[in-house]
């Protein structure tokens, strides 16, 4: 007799789930020498004690906290990108600009990056055809827990001059329900962090406003401000010679404003 | 059985651009990095570089930076090298190469090779 | 860089004899070292990683040892098919390096 299961509104497990986690995890040591020490059988083991047998609406920080530990790693704090809504042209950057990371160029952002899973209360099988949506369903599930608990650690790990990728193209450039909004905003320390830098990234090709003076814009310095975290604004105005800027500093084109 | 095969011979002039092929069969493609590793004639061996397939990111030897290019498409799991402003000294027979995560990080699985003649 | 220095270049055996060929890192490396062998015209094949342990495949016969910067490849009694050129790697950091290989010929 087939067991009743639970019907949630968002995407089931991504497929291979376990072998794409495993796989990203050599992966990530072979790229990055100074993490060989990692034992990704342990990590693997530690993301799937996470949520495996746990009802996908009831996932805590805590759930999280061995696989946090096995995921330690220390990037230079001064040389973090935050984004929002805009992440394939923050990767773009960081692939160009190789000091500086996005929370996707550390071993746990790696890991879970584009990926979706949950489990089941009581049964150790993984849920491939459905899990709860974030607004639908549930918000302690466990791809937004895992993403609220390594924001916040990468947010509080930032120092001196944070960088944060914004989308002009859209209605809220800054918008409070995001993650960088809800979490990382909230959790850059005061007594770390100098300032917040946001780069407005304009989609449009004759698109010259000063997008800065944005009333989202304006809503982020306010709540930086009153975090006693100086705030600064830039505009992006050609995103694809911003990057190419970014790969030859030295080309005659690149003094003018990007 | 893994498999990684790599295009035919080439032979360029000086200052062209030769694109090499290295289509993979037996695993899955996303899972693995892909190195490419140049052999000049009766020389030793030179790591070029690597590709994560899965998302695109590269990594050159300070050698070959500016003039190399690895790419990867997912649709047909092949991976590319790239190699522009040949010169004489390019001539060599050049390897896609991986490892095989369990095997350290030692190349586990290589092509067959693919010779590229820079002559003009 | 680190710079991977094999010694002999070329070294000439017997069939039966036990060679060893010498590799040093110019800076500590641990154990991230593999050995491999090649032969006229064709791609190079692992023997050795981890610089100890033996790949699939590999005739018990070749083992390696060492860490940090002093590695050795030994051939306990060489065979027919084992004369070919030999080249040791360091995977301990980018950009990743070889030696510059051992050519192991018939006396």
């Known amino acids: 007799v087939p067991r009743w299961r639970q019907q949630w509104s968002g995407p089931g497990t991504t497929k291979r789930f376990p072998e794409t986690v495993l796989a990203r995890c050599v992966k990530y040591t072979e790229i990055h020498p100074e993490m060989r020490h990692v034992d990704c059988q342990s990590v693997w083991d530690a993301f799937k004690g996470a949520f495996i047998s746990k009802h996908p609406c009831n996932i805590t920080e805590e759930d999280y906290q061995p696989l946090m530990k096995l995921g330690t790693q220390t990037v230079p704090c001064n040389k973090i990108l935050l984004w929002s809504r805009i992440k394939d042209l923050a990767h773009q950057f960081t692939q160009v600009q190789r000091d500086m990371f996005t929370l996707e160029d550390t071993l746990l952002g790696y890991l879970a990056d584009d990926l979706t899973w949950c489990g089941e209360f009581n049964t150790s099988k993984i849920n491939y055809q459905s899990c709860p949506d974030w607004r639908k369903d549930c918000s302690n599930n466990p791809v937004s827990v895992f993403w609220k608990t390594v924001s916040r650690r990468f947010a509080e790990a930032a120092c001196d001059v944070v960088h944060v990728m914004l989308n002009g193209s859209r209605s809220k450039i800054f918008d409070k329900n995001s993650t960088f909004g809800s979490v990382e905003v909230h959790n850059l320390q005061p007594e770390k962090v100098q300032t917040l830098e946001a780069w407005v990234i304009h989609g449009g090709r004759e698109d010259s406003r000063d997008l800065c003076q944005d009333p989202t814009i304006k809503e982020l310095e306010s709540i930086i401000s009153k975090r006693n975290i100086q705030f600064s604004c830039k505009n992006i105005y050609r995103p694809d010679k911003f990057l190419q800027c970014v790969k030859n500093p030295e080309d005659s084109s690149c003094t003018s404003e990007i | 059985e893994v498999q990684l095969v790599q295009s035919g011979a080439e032979v360029k002039k000086p200052g062209a651009t030769v694109k090499i092929s290295c289509k993979v069969s037996?695993?899955?493609?996303?899972?693995?990095?892909m190195h490419w590793v140049q052999q000049a004639p009766g020389k030793g061996l030179e790591w070029m570089g690597w590709?994560?397939?899965?998302?695109?990111?590269?990594d050159y030897a300070e050698k070959f930076q500016g003039r190399v290019t690895i790419t990867a498409d997912t649709s047909t799991d092949t991976a590319y090298m790239e190699l522009s402003s040949l010169r004489s000294e390019d001539t060599a027979v050049y390897y896609c190469?991986?490892?095989?995560?369990?095997?350290?990080?030692?190349?586990?699985?290589w092509g067959q090779g693919t010779l590229v003649t820079v002559s003009s | 860089d680190i710079q991977m220095t094999q010694s002999p270049s070329t070294l000439s055996a017997s069939v039966g004899d036990r060679v060893t060929i010498t590799c040093r890192a110019s800076?500590?490396?641990?154990?991230?070292l593999a050995w491999y062998q090649q032969k006229p015209g064709k791609a190079p094949k692992l023997l050795i990683y981890?610089?100890?342990s033996l790949a699939d495949g590999v005739p018990s016969r070749f083992s390696g040892s060492g860490s940090g910067t002093e590695f050795t490849l030994t051939i306990s009694s060489l065979q027919p098919d084992d004369f070919a050129t030999y080249y040791c790697?360091?995977?301990?950091?980018?950009?990743?390096?070889f030696g510059q290989g051992t050519k192991l010929e018939i006396k």
């Open positions: 790697q360091q995977y301990n950091n980018y950009p990743y390096t």
């Open positions: 981890d610089a100890n």
């Open positions: 190469a991986r490892s095989a995560h369990t095997t350290g990080f030692g190349f586990a699985y």
């Open positions: 590709i994560d397939p899965e998302y695109g990111r590269t």
């Open positions: 037996g695993y899955t493609f996303t899972d693995y990095i």
């Open positions: 800076e500590d490396i641990y154990s991230n």
